[in-house]
């Protein structure tokens, strides 16, 4: 049976609205919840597309609004349609389209042909997309003070760029308890908004923000060592796009060190943790003397999944240690703000050459085939992978 409604279903999850002049909004489309495809045509009264219009269309993957009266698409129009991958807005009355409109979408196809698009910095992102062949952009006509059949380049004197963002930081070293003043300087045309992103700072400092474009100020009050390795970000937006810059405030504090008991892993490991800012230099002592690192005994840092902390963990790695490696291991850590040391006794194996007359004398019988090897106490058969 033919459909006489304004919008008719197409397949299990499509909707086609083509009866001329019957829609001025897309709000409240019936059965829109599981819609994946929406096709709108010949709707001269449909002039604006706002984010409320597509609310509830979370599954939408393809949107076509063609040969209609669309003049304005809100920057957040597609906030509720994150899966949108095909967008065709050809043959409407669009003069511009904000970069924010498509931000966050994984568009495979964007068609804007047949619109009186005005060549300005606000469309620089679109020009770049087309030049780079991104996601099948089709524009065909972009007007620069007059109609034309191709995407006209912006004039040579026109400088379209995202804002330039710089953060000024203190030159002096920052210590625990200090107040730190940061300033974000923004330059650029048609600046719209700017702000700080401080999500990583919770608990590391009290924050006070002040000022507005083009200069934003930030005071971090009573900083702690937890502030280290945390990003402080300033962002700014204009017609062309968004820019952001991140810095990390380095808060100095003395070296500290912790040693654990030797554990037998793939090789032997004397585990340690060191902290301090700047990162402390490390030195090992063995029985009070400097221990020079070699391929048999060396420091190996563990690659931490946490890149936002100053503490480093690692091992003094001992490859197949013998009785000569038994003794007292000390780790010295030092930075300009202090030094620390920790020691641990390690016994890897007994001295096989110490003979006690009262010990029983071991007797071993070789197998008949004679294919035997003498085994040293330290050996762990085939435990170390070759090369």
């Amino acid at each position: 049976a033919s459909c006489r409604e304004v919008c008719c279903p197409v397949g299990p999850s499509g909707l086609r609205c083509t009866r001329a002049g019957s829609l001025d909004t897309l709000r409240g489309l019936r059965g829109a919840g599981n819609l994946t495809e929406l096709y709108v045509e010949n709707q001269q009264h449909l002039q604006r597309l706002e984010f409320e219009d597509l609310q509830g269309l979370g599954e939408l993957r393809s949107l076509t609004i063609v040969k209609s009266g669309l003049r304005f698409v809100a920057p957040d129009a597609f906030r509720f349609t994150p899966r949108l991958s095909h967008l065709n807005l050809s043959s409407n009355a669009l003069e511009s389209l904000s970069w924010k409109t498509v931000q966050g979408l994984s568009l495979q196809d964007l068609t804007l042909s047949g619109n009186p698009l005005h060549c300005s910095c606000a469309l620089f992102w679109l020009q770049r997309w087309e030049q780079e062949g991104l996601c099948g952009v089709h524009t065909q006509t972009l007007h620069d003070s007059g109609p034309g059949d191709q995407f006209l380049p912006l004039g040579h004197n026109t400088s379209c760029g995202v804002p330039t963002v710089k953060i000024q930081m203190p030159n002096d070293s920052v210590e625990v308890g200090d107040d730190v003043f940061l300033q974000c300087q923004v330059e650029g045309l048609a600046l719209q908004q700017a702000d700080w992103i401080l999500t990583e700072l919770e608990g590391a400092a009290t924050v006070k923000k002040f000022g507005d474009l083009p200069s934003l100020g930030l005071i971090l009050v009573n900083v702690t060592s937890d502030l280290n390795k945390k990003n402080v970000t300033c962002w700014a937006e204009n017609d062309v796009g968004r820019a952001e810059v991140s810095v990390q405030v380095s808060v100095s504090f003395p070296a500290s060190v912790h040693l654990g008991l030797a554990v037998e892993q793939h090789h032997w490991c004397i585990p340690f943790s060191v902290d301090g800012q700047p990162a402390p230099s490390l030195r090992w002592l063995f029985n009070g003397s400097v221990l020079n690192e070699t391929s048999f005994i060396f420091t190996q840092f563990l690659e931490s999944a946490l890149t936002n902390e100053t503490m480093r963990h690692g091992c003094l790695r001992l490859n197949q240690p013998t009785h000569v490696n038994n003794g007292n291991y000390t780790l010295l850590a030092a930075n300009p703000y202090g030094q620390a040391a920790a020691s641990v006794m390690a016994a890897f194996m007994d001295n096989p050459f110490e003979f006690n007359p009262e010990d029983p004398i071991p007797v071993s019988f070789s197998p008949v085939d004679g294919n035997s090897t003498s085994r040293d106490p330290v050996e762990k058969k085939d435990e170390t992978p070759f090369g």
Epitope: S295, F298, T299, T373, D376, E379, T384, G387
Partner: antibody, heavy 117, light 109 residues
């Protein structure tokens, strides 16, 4: 699998310097020591020294300190030895080997250096 | 610097057991010297056979074994095969450096 690929043969003038490369694949370059070994006919094998790429720790055989310089580029997983002030005594085949003590590791195929005027 | 001494040449027959030894000029070879045995075949093809006195890496045939015999390190090939004809180097660790022996040329006739 672990592989060490060395650069090609070099013909050098006395007094010049040469840099030999050892490109590694199949393991985490920064975590294992690279050994350098010299082989000369009639002189057997001589250990030049070792480097731990991830931390830049270097141990030289005292006999080659000043003659050999070890470096490593962790971005390309490549170890290098530079031999300076070359003389005929430096004509030899030079090997790199990845060591995993107590094993003396996987070896490269060697780079022949000939010093001749 | 220590000197490591090996037999210059040995000859054996297929199926026989042969033992190569390695002496240190500083005294008895101990487990702290981590004796290694490396095989060299033509065209500079080196393969590690034994590490840490008596550890055999994966892939090395079981006929190769390492041990300490008296004050020397030893490599024993039980049931030698023709493809075992090669030069065998002993390598010893002295606290912070390796020293190679002069190598033993093994002929399997």
């Amino acid at each position: 699998q672990v592989q060490l690929q060395q650069s090609g043969a070099e013909l050098m003038k006395p007094g010049a310097s040469v840099k030999i490369s050892c490109k590694t694949t199949g393991y985490r370059f920064s975590s294992y020591w690279i050994e350098w070994v010299k082989q000369r006919p009639g002189h057997g094998l001589e250990w030049l020294g070792e480097i731990l790429p991830g931390r830049g720790i270097i141990n030289y055989n005292e006999n080659f300190r000043g003659k050999a310089t070890f470096t490593a580029d962790t971005s390309s997983n490549t170890a290098y030895v530079q031999l300076s002030s070359l003389t005929s005594e430096d004509s030899a085949v030079y090997f790199c080997a990845r060591t995993d003590p107590p094993y003396f590791g996987v070896w490269g195929a060697g780079t022949t250096v000939t010093v001749s005027s | 610097q220590a000197v490591v001494t090996q037999e210059s040449a040995l000859t054996t027959s297929p199926g026989e057991t042969v033992t190569l030894t390695c002496r240190s000029s500083t005294g008895a070879v101990t487990i702290s010297n981590y004796a290694n045995w490396v095989q060299e075949k033509p065209d500079h093809l080196f393969t590690g056979l034994i590490g840490g006195t008596n550890n055999r890496p994966p892939g090395v045939p079981a006929r190769f074994s390492g041990s300490l015999i008296g004050d020397k390190a030893a490599l024993t090939i039980t049931g030698a095969q023709t493809e075992d004809e090669a030069i065998y180097f002993c390598v010893l660790w002295y606290s912070n450096h390796w020293v190679f022996g002069g190598g033993t040329k093994l002929t399997v006739l």
